[in-house]
Interface confidence: low
Amino acid sequence: APVRSLNCTLRDSQQKSLVMSGPYELKALHLQGQDMEQQVVFSMSFVQGEESNDKIPVALGLKEKNLYLSCVLKDDKPTLQLESVDPKNYPKKKMEKRFVFNKIEINNKLEFESAQFPNWYISTSQAENMPVFLGGTKGGQDITDFTMQFVSS
């Protein structure tokens, strides 16, 4: 069955962009001008999951890379990672739960809640050049709000 996808970039509410930091990590920092080309382009796929009017289940792959953001337990803590997948089989409508995020839109801002670990969100630090991570608090120091920009394929 087809899975609908669109290409986009994400910026946190402080306008920090997301870039690759090594092969399996993302970091958030302010970019300007030509440096904007460094930001990662996501292929956001609309997948199966528990749905409600305000929660849309999505998977976040890196465009033209066989890497997906996934949520796993590491040392008993929910952790965000970039996971390599077989490109012949992904994306698919029925993604494993660790790949699924509930995209929540509030006042034109987006949050991405882990479907595997409810109330844990894709987060960035206030500080520059720090890893993107899975955070268990909202409304504190860490940033959980993002905006989405469409990218032509």
């Epitope: 609908r4 996808s5 669109l6 290409n7 199966q48 849309i56 999505v58 469409f150 032509s152 394929s153």
Partner: antibody, heavy 120, light 107 residues
Framework: QVQLVQSGAEVKKPGASVKVSCKVS????????IEWVRQAPGKGLEWIGE????????NYNEKFKGKATITADTSTDTAYMELSSLRSEDTAVYYC?????????????WGQGTLVTVSA | DIKMTQSPSSMYASLGERVTITCKAS??????LSWFQQKPGKSPKTLIY???RLVDGVPSRFSGSASGQDYSLTISSLQYEDMGIYYC?????????FGGGTKLEIK
């Protein structure tokens, strides 16, 4: 409010081409799939294909590949469908409709339809 | 292609009557099903998507349900303005396919 306004009726000779437009207003054009559906006289509905203007993704019904070409112009918030090598069996009302790109893909709004008549 | 078999192809019903129209999918469509109403000479109007989600502004007398690969549209109490042709659509697999339609007329 959301509106999809299609171009007017067309009469074409067999072998000719026709380009139907669908001008969208009332929402962010790039964020919604535009669907194209046809209805031959007295018949049911048939899905032709779709385009997501935000990134140009297009999906066609295999039956209409080579017959229909779907495009979108984000500068004018207009989607187009061109039909080539017209035959009498292409006589139909052609509809555009939109679906919200990320919520269950439920068709929500429809254009008024464009009647294309193919006649020698 | 997935075949959507809609029944009945036409029916008469009385005002106030409960009416049910069904669509049977030839394979699993994962509840990706919409219902439309079309009146003569008019564009289709979306009533329901994802089996049972009512589009804004659609009267609550319309409802949708599923049992396996059988999908139903029910009008709890038929009104005069409900006459028209009803279509189902599966949008799980390309090409998306419509049912053949059910012509609903007032008795």
């Amino acid at each position: 409010q959301v509106q999809l306004v299609q171009s007017g009726a067309e009469v074409k000779k067999p072998g000719a081409s026709v380009k139907v437009s669908c001008k969208v207003s009332g929402y962010t054009f790039s964020r919604y799939w535009i669907e194209w559906v046809r209805q031959a006289p007295g018949k049911g509905l048939e899905w032709i294909g779709e385009i997501l203007p935000g990134n140009g993704n297009i999906n066609y019904n295999e039956k209409f590949k080579g017959k229909a070409t779907i495009t979108a112009d984000t500068s004018t918030d207009t989607a187009y469908m061109e039909l080539s090598s017209l035959r009498s069996e292409d006589t139909a009302v052609y509809y555009c409709s939109t679906i919200y790109y990320d919520y269950d893909q439920g068709f929500t709004y429809w254009g008024q339809g464009t009647l294309v008549t193919v006649s020698a | 292609d997935i075949k959507m078999t809609q029944s009945p192809s036409s029916m008469y019903a009385s005002l106030g009557e409960r009416v049910t129209i069904t669509c049977k999918a030839s394979q699993d469509i994962d509840r990706y099903l919409s219902w439309f109403q079309q009146k003569p000479g008019k564009s289709p109007k979306t009533l329901i998507y994802r089996v049972k989600r009512l589009v804004d502004g659609v009267p609550s007398r319309f409802s949708g349900s599923a049992s396996g690969q059988d999908y139903s549209l029910t009008i709890s109490s038929l009104q005069y303005e409900d006459m028209g042709i009803y279509y189902c659509l599966q949008y799980d697999e390309f090409p998306y396919t419509f049912g053949g339609g059910t012509k609903l007329e007032i008795k």
